[in-house]
């Protein structure tokens, strides 16, 4: 791969335009933040492939890594990749923004990590501090990556001075996850049960031959002991399992169940806990919110999602205008309810290539023998605007009229504009807006009708032109939230016998 300019580091001016070229023996592509920005790809007569990335109106946010790579690395000897780092010094951008994954740094062992605070200017001096601390920490800084070193479990910020202004980065949180030398896991057949149902828990240890299990649980505290059963999972080496089974649970069995495992050889121990909830009866409750008015765009697919918690597993039904919905054989509607955790569910209604008739009142009902919940919303279908008619007429009054008719949902706005110089319009001259109250030479009359059956608005607008002394290009533009459409007509003076 050949990259021009070769880099590996470039410093470019803010607001400038810059061209990066990459060429190779197979198709090549530029990548930025794991995505492919718009670029021009070509193949030369000699068989080399190239891609040109034009960076326009550069800002500090364009600072970062750019990679050129083979578009399809199959069959190539090496998965070759060229890296280029671009700085765009920009005093309006302090530290480059980070996403949540970069702000919270989790570790499972003592290892070197990087606090990724980066600036747009390689000349800036950057220091690292504990959050709310003034003392700079002696950690090496790389302008392309950030501060690298071994960090304690704390929160840190970076500081720099841009001009006469001190700028702080977001805080970075370093958090070391505790990893024990005995690997214990506890799970339950169900963590939520109704009174009278069984509680069954399993505690599993991997990689130890001789261990001792000790359970603590709510019943134990009141002196009612339950004898656990210990077994070996024969198909796996050194997987030892302890099972605690409580038949016919009572409300008092709610609480924390802890499995403590000790191994006497190295004097290691570990414990894991799980929370069990015994409920008097089942429940269904909505989580999050769904607005009472939802929108879908005509001929596009739309998924409506409801999240709820329930135990025991509920039946879920969807209704439209009080009629039960089911998966349609034509594949126009798809219903699915997923169990995303033990008691949490996501129910989805997918409308494939939405039709006008699918507007209406939708309800999701989730229920079982103990409880039920329902959620309703109105679905509005948005239809992109279309100009259906644009016509010009010469009434006897001497004035000339142009009529524009169009439809869409939500209600379209109408914009009239005109251009007097046909040769230079509209590329060189901007069109003039018409129909403003201050304009004496044009008058506007607009009527709006809502068509119930088609569930869309029709707009009819008539533009009256008082005196047309030379050919005029009149444009009608309709616009709504999901699109716009334009038509144009040329209006000629009465005196001219033909239209251009």
């Amino acid at each position: 791969l050949v990259v021009t300019p070769p880099g590996p580091e470039l410093v470019l001016n803010v607001s400038s335009t810059f061209v990066l070229t990459c060429s190779g023996s197979a198709p090549v592509v530029w990548e930025r933040m794991s995505q492919e920005p718009p670029q021009e790809m070509a193949k030369a007569q000699d068989g080399t492939f190239s891609s040109v990335l034009t960076l326009t109106n550069l800002t500090g946010l364009d600072t970062g890594e750019y990679f050129c790579t083979h578009n399809d690395s199959r069959g190539l000897e090496t998965d070759e990749r060229k890296r280029l780092y671009i700085f765009v010094p920009d005093p309006t951008v302090g530290f480059l923004p980070n996403d949540a994954e970069e702000l919270f740094i989790f570790l499972t062992e003592i290892t070197e990590i990087t606090i990724p605070c980066r600036v747009t200017d390689p000349q800036l001096v950057v220091t690292l501090h504990e959050k709310k601390g003034d003392v700079a920490l002696p950690v090496p800084y790389d302008h392309q990556r950030g501060f690298s070193g071994i960090f304690e479990d704390r929160s840190y910020i970076c500081k720099t001075t841009i001009g006469d202004r001190e700028v702080d980065s977001d805080a970075y949180y370093v958090y070391r996850l505790q990893v024990s030398s005995i690997n214990v896991s506890v799970n339950a057949v169900q963590t939520v049960v109704r009174q009278g149902e069984n509680i069954t828990l399993m505690c599993i240890v991997i990689g130890n031959e001789v261990v001792n299990f000790e359970w603590t649980y709510p019943r134990k505290e009141s002196g009612r002991l339950v004898e656990p059963v210990t077994d070996f999972l024969l198909d796996m080496p050194y997987h030892i399992r302890s099972i605690l089974h409580i038949p016919s649970a009572e409300l008092e069995d709610s609480g924390t169940y802890t499995c403590n495992v000790t191994e006497s050889v190295n004097d290691h121990q570990d414990e894991k806990a799980i929370n069990i909830t015994v409920v008097e009866s089942g429940y269904v409750r909505l989580l999050g919110e769904v607005g009472t008015l939802q929108f879908a765009e005509l001929h596009r697919s739309r998924t409506l999602q409801v999240v709820f918690e329930a135990y025991p597993p509920p039946t879920v039904l969807w209704f439209k205008d009080n009629r039960t919905l089911g998966d349609s054989s034509a594949g126009e509607i798809a219903l699915s309810t997923r169990n995303v955790s033990e008691t949490r569910y996501v129910s989805e209604l997918t409308l494939v290539r939405v039709k006008v008739a699918e507007a209406g009142h939708y309800t999701m009902r989730a229920f079982h023998e103990d409880a039920e919940v329902q959620l309703s919303f109105q679905l509005q279908i948005n239809v992109p605007v279309r100009v259906l008619e644009l016509s010009e007429s010469h009434p006897d009054s001497g004035e000339q009229t142009v009529r524009c008719r169009g439809r869409g949902m939500p209600q379209p706005n109408i914009i009239w504009s005109a251009c007097r110089d046909l040769k230079r319009c509209p590329r060189e001259l901007p069109p003039t807006l018409l129909g403003n109250s201050s304009e004496e030479e044009s008058q506007l009359e607009t009527n709006v009708t809502y068509w119930e059956e088609e569930q869309e608005f029709e707009v009819v607008s008539t533009l009256r032109l008082q005196h047309v002394d030379r050919p005029l290009s009149v444009r009608c533009t309709l616009r709504n939230a999901v699109g716009q459409d334009t038509q144009e007509v040329i209006v000629v003076p009465h005196s001219l016998p033909f239209k251009v």
Epitope: L103, F104, F106, D168, D170, N275, L287, G288
Partner: antibody, heavy 127, light 107 residues
Framework: EVQLVESGGGLVQPGGSLRLSCGAS????????MTWVRQAPGKGLEWVGN????????YSVDSVKGRFTISRDNAKNSLYLQMNRVRAEDTAVYYC????????????????????WGLGTTVTVSS | DIQMTQSPSTLSASVGDRVIITCRAS??????LAWYQQQPGKAPKLLIY???SLESGVPSRFSGSGSGTEFTLTIGSLQPDDFATYYC?????????FGQGTKVDIK
């Protein structure tokens, strides 16, 4: 300087509507969960609701469900609370705060608290 | 829903005293607990998260402990700035719940 500034409070009649705003500065707003908390006169703190980084997850306390809506505009570094069908018991100082919710680690989730708060805006519901 | 109960509701103490505030959860919440301080007319301030982790910039006289259902906030040696109301707060993946508060005033 990391800062949150609430606005939009005032006097509103029962059944009426009000929209509170919270402007954020000094941090990457789009990378954080945000929360609304309220405090009735002479009473304790009550969580109203929260919203994740891109607005795809929203949660709220039962007493405001169906009446209040939380939203955000990351391009404007702003958090909003749309209050509809207000009641006398909604009278309070409303605070917005930054909620430190790291991405999940396997099955575990962690939480580092509400570390930045605004000064609050007062909402009075009275006829 | 999980209830958080703080005790005492009011506590009278003098500068230099060691102060302990308790927060009880109606069921096991592991270590999913934070503590806040609120001075009159001001916004709350985060002191402790994850039951025992001290927030940056908070004096080391504040400490938190506990897990499961019983938690404590300890102020090692009360300073004039510490006369305020303290709240515990439980969190899970889709809600937050505050205790009713403990007011620490001058004896």
């Amino acid at each position: 300087e990391v800062q949150l500034v609430e606005s939009g409070g005032g006097l509103v009649q029962p059944g009426g509507s009000l929209r509170l705003s919270c402007g954020a500065s000094g941090f990457t707003f789009s990378s954080y969960w945000m929360t609304w908390v309220r405090q009735a006169p002479g009473k304790g703190l009550e969580w109203v609701g929260n919203i994740n980084q891109d607005g795809s997850e929203k949660y709220s306390v039962d007493s405001v469900k169906g009446r209040f809506t939380i939203s955000r505009d990351n391009a404007k570094n702003s958090l909003y609370l749309q209050m509809n069908r207000v009641r006398a018991e909604d009278t309070a100082v409303y605070y917005c705060s930054r909620d430190l919710v790291p991405p999940r680690q396997g099955d575990n989730y962690y939480y580092f608290g509400m570390d930045v708060w605004g000064l609050g805006t007062t909402v009075t519901v009275s006829s | 829903d999980i209830q958080m109960t703080q005790s005492p509701s009011t506590l009278s103490a003098s500068v230099g005293d060691r102060v302990i505030i308790t927060c009880r959860a109606s069921q096991n919440i592991n270590n999913w607990l934070a503590w806040y301080q609120q001075q009159p007319g001001k916004a709350p301030k985060l002191l402790i998260y994850e039951a025992s982790s001290l927030e940056s910039g908070v004096p080391s006289r504040f400490s938190g402990s506990g897990s499961g259902t019983e938690f404590t906030l300890t102020i090692g040696s009360l300073q004039p700035d510490d006369f305020a109301t303290y709240y515990c707060q439980h969190y899970n993946s889709y809600s937050r719940t505050f205790g009713q508060g403990t007011k620490v005033d001058i004896k």
